[in-house]
């Protein structure tokens, strides 16, 4: 039975040209995390595999940096980066947990972080 929950940075906003950290945290489970995928809609951005370490998709290598931790840093943001991002925790023996973050990239200098929220 899946007992864990994923806490994410929730809905966040950032300025065009700046950077942002996408963070998820899996809690309330003793399951072993075997891999974390970071995905944007239908694209695989990066993977952190327990055995193989970090791998960044070639098309994002210039603008995506691993970490901190199991998080992901997006750099040189453009308005096209606005959208949903997913952290997908592959765990053993529980199975798969998914967290969602919505990022809005703003032209203006006003960018505030949204509240944290949980996905069971």
């Amino acid at each position: 039975m899946m007992t864990g929950t994923i806490e994410t940075t929730g809905n966040i906003s950032a300025e065009k040209g700046g950077s942002i950290i996408l963070q998820c945290h899996l809690s309330s489970t003793t399951a072993q995390v075997t891999q974390v995928n970071w995905e944007q809609q239908d694209q695989l951005l990066a993977i952190c595999n327990a055995d193989l370490g970090w791998h960044i998709s070639p098309s994002f290598k210039d603008r995506v940096a691993p970490g901190p931790g199991l998080g992901l840093t997006l750099q040189s943001l453009t308005v096209n980066d606005t959208g949903e991002y997913f952290c997908i925790y592959h765990t053993y023996p529980d199975g798969t947990y998914t967290g969602r973050i919505f990022l809005e990239v703003l032209e203006s200098s006003v960018a505030e972080h949204g509240a944290r929220f949980q996905i069971p």
Partner: antibody
Amino acid sequence: EVQLVQSGAEVKKPGSSVKVSCKASGYTFASYGISWVRQAPGQGLEWMGGITPFFNRVDVAEKFQGRVTITADKSTSTAYIELSSLRSEDTAVYYCARDLRRGGVGDAFDIWGRGTLVTVSS
Amino acid sequence: QSALTQPRSVSGSPGQSVTISCTGTSPDVGSHAYRSWYQQHPGKAPKLMIYEVSYRPSGVSNRFSGSKSGNTASLTISGLQAEDEADYYCSSYPPSSATVFGAGTKLTVL
């Protein structure tokens, strides 16, 4: 449309090798693992191994280690399996199958090729 | 000898429900969540019906459901239809380990 198209049937002599291809289309090839599963006539499914192009990681079932080579060509979105030292019991339909989830952690297989019949006979 | 044990055959009449069991007989394929079920009609490629014990891929009828208790996963088909007659395979795929298939169960619709 997401699909896997396999190469045609092969007839091989014992002791020889066979190489089967699996061309993917309709998705980002490098993001998903591809496994090879075979099925002897009237028998069940048998996982042989798989490749995750994103990591260039290859896993081969213990039974086939030393006899199976699995490769992928990202430029043509094609996966290959080569089986050497063929014997009559290798006669089977060989399927390629795509991981359900991106990243190739070893997974359920949601897209399958139609299969390639390999017959080993003297 | 597979590390997953399935009954060789099951049968049922149209409209009935049938359940196929799949028991892990080794620690590698024990009580984890990575279990799936495939349907295979004669001469066709397998089709994924259930993954991670109880999740249905899009396009699969909600007459198919999966569950697990301990080392045993089960596939239940409700409202049995003639086209459900096929072979069914369970699979175990723990991360970073070999995928294992059960020997298969032949479902006959009477």
